[in-house]
Amino acid sequence: QRFAQAQQQLPLESLGWDVAELQLNHTGPQQDPRLYWQGGPALGRSFLHGPELDKGQLRIHRDGIYMVHIQVTLAICSSTTASRHHPTTLAVGICSPASRSISLLRLSFHQGCTIASQRLTPLARGDTLCTNLTGTLLPSRNTDETFFGVQWVRP
Amino acid sequence: QRFAQAQQQLPLESLGWDVAELQLNHTGPQQDPRLYWQGGPALGRSFLHGPELDKGQLRIHRDGIYMVHIQVTLAICSSTTASRHHPTTLAVGICSPASRSISLLRLSFHQGCTIASQRLTPLARGDTLCTNLTGTLLPSRNTDETFFGVQWVRP
Amino acid sequence: QRFAQAQQQLPLESLGWDVAELQLNHTGPQQDPRLYWQGGPALGRSFLHGPELDKGQLRIHRDGIYMVHIQVTLAICSSTTASRHHPTTLAVGICSPASRSISLLRLSFHQGCTIASQRLTPLARGDTLCTNLTGTLLPSRNTDETFFGVQWVRP
């Protein structure tokens, strides 16, 4: 029973349980393909426990292997719309520091209006994740249609 | 070595490792869009460790942040079928208690026959998750095509 | 503080944090629908911590419930290509030992060029996971478009 007590007394952060789930705040200006995210209990069911937001982009605070997941739904979209505006592509990557810049996850919409995926990837303290949506369609801001999150899995 | 021993001696439930993976049992009667789930080793590779089923719906037993995931494939489906019967939509949400009712995850099939997604969300003991499939197509009952699960991630 | 120290002193393997993320190496010869995977820091962001590769297939080293996830993108693909070459199907399953052979996860591409999904499933030490891609289209080898991984979740 001592372990359970000790576990409860330790701050969760020391267990490495960094986790975040974000909702879409807004898209960038015309030449900026990035999606800008927001999170926090006041906004609904989004949250940040460990990672932080830096101008709408997610910054990692703890080294480790993370499960990164995302779903993006296009607004006012049908399969006809999606195919007409192809290619619409979503990419998740490390955008800073520049020395670690890399695309982690990439999907095209083709004739669909939603993409959803997830992957495991090593991330380091200070890595900032950017989500780039290229194309001429807007992402839905509905919190059950568009979201982005990370979960620390192991060192 | 003492920690490893202590960890083994503690029931897993005290570590908060609640997890469930369910397979489709049946659809509801005509006016009920809910999918009804089942789980347990006798049924194959589905299981419930912590959460419970209440009339085919998943009830949470431990507060925390959960990874919720789902895949639903439509039966005898082609891209023509899927587009013809649009909108066919799947929504996962908290359906009880009514005070906490909210849609957590929503996807449309458009010209595809399978949707799959996942998200992190806070859930509380007593929350019941419902999966609503609206449209005129049947979900596949094959266990490798349609499944629904949750995994406790952190308090 | 003693718990945190003890946790750090224990090898991670004893905590059961087996995890792997793989990138596509190559496809099989004509009659072999399996995808052959590779992983390791020298290759980029793929890794194996616990599980091993056996002739390009993933072998599990620890009993437990795992989150299995995959994304496969077809090379030089458009919705027209995908629908023309239908059915193109991806299946993830236990392929050995033969006594435990079963399909865990199955998706068709229909009019899309990417599939992505995830599920929780019990796996046992010695289980080898195979990913079968049937059809006449090649999978992309880009590491942000095609990947396959597992994460140990609980005993």
Epitope: - | L24, T73, A75, T80, R84, T136, L137, L138 | -
Partner: antibody
């Protein structure tokens, strides 16, 4: 409750065409395939084809070798089945039918049937 | 096309007794965890009436003395206790693929 009401009996000459109508009420016409099934006197049931009124897509039984044409008018919730190059063996009761909830080809609702007699 | 073969062609059963009609498909009509097999009852001068869908599901309003079973290629319609109003022709039908096809029918009479 869905109701399917068909047009009245017809007597036709061999080589001519017949067009049977089926008016739907009480349901969402455009969301479900409307099927046509025929039954020759004292014989079994034979599926002829179907239309999805939402977009006009059709499926036909190849046994009719292009002689059958199914159309739909969403504005009046009416489906039509036209059979050309009639011969005596086309004498049958023609039914329209559809599912109640799931849009697969089993048939909860049926029209009352239209007897088409082909005789010289 | 999938060929549906019913047996017997005709059947005479005493009131209150069990009636069993079989239907065999020339290939499996099961897919996605369902059996796409359905049963109808047709009385003279009336359109067919759906009794059972997806092999074993009782259509709303149909008496529970009717039941269906089977999977793959072999299916059975059972009337547990025959009533006078059950005299009719019974058809099986698949909807696994296009075209859907019907069995030739089984005529059920009272012995």
């Amino acid at each position: 409750e869905v109701q399917l009401v068909q047009s009245g009996a017809e007597v036709k000459k061999p080589g001519s065409s017949v067009k049977v109508s089926c008016k739907a009420s009480g349901g969402t016409f455009s969301r479900y395939n409307m099927h046509w099934v025929r039954q020759a006197p004292g014989q079994g049931l034979e599926w002829m084809g179907a239309i999805f009124p939402g977009n006009g897509e059709t499926s036909y039984n190849q046994n009719f070798k292009g002689r059958v044409t199914i159309t739909a008018d969403k504005s009046t919730s009416t489906a039509y089945m036209e059979l050309s190059s009639l011969r005596s063996e086309d004498t049958a009761v023609y039914y329209c039918a559809r599912n109640s909830y799931y849009d697969y080809a089993w048939f909860t609702y049926w029209g009352q049937g239209t007897l088409v007699t082909v005789s010289s | 096309d999938i060929v549906m073969t019913q047996s017997p062609d005709s059947l005479a059963v005493s009131l209150g007794e069990r009636a069993t009609i079989n239907c065999r498909a020339s290939k499996s009509v099961s897919s996605s965890g369902y059996s796409f097999m359905h049963w109808y009852q047709q009385k003279p001068g009336q359109p067919p009436k759906l009794l059972i869908y997806l092999a074993s599901n009782l259509e709303s309003g149909v008496p529970d003395r009717f039941s269906g079973s089977g999977s793959g290629t072999d299916f059975t319609l059972t009337i547990s206790s025959l009533q006078a109003e059950d005299v009719a022709v019974y058809y099986c039908q698949h909807s696994r693929e296009f075209p859907p096809t019907f069995g030739q029918g089984t005529k059920l009479e009272i012995k």
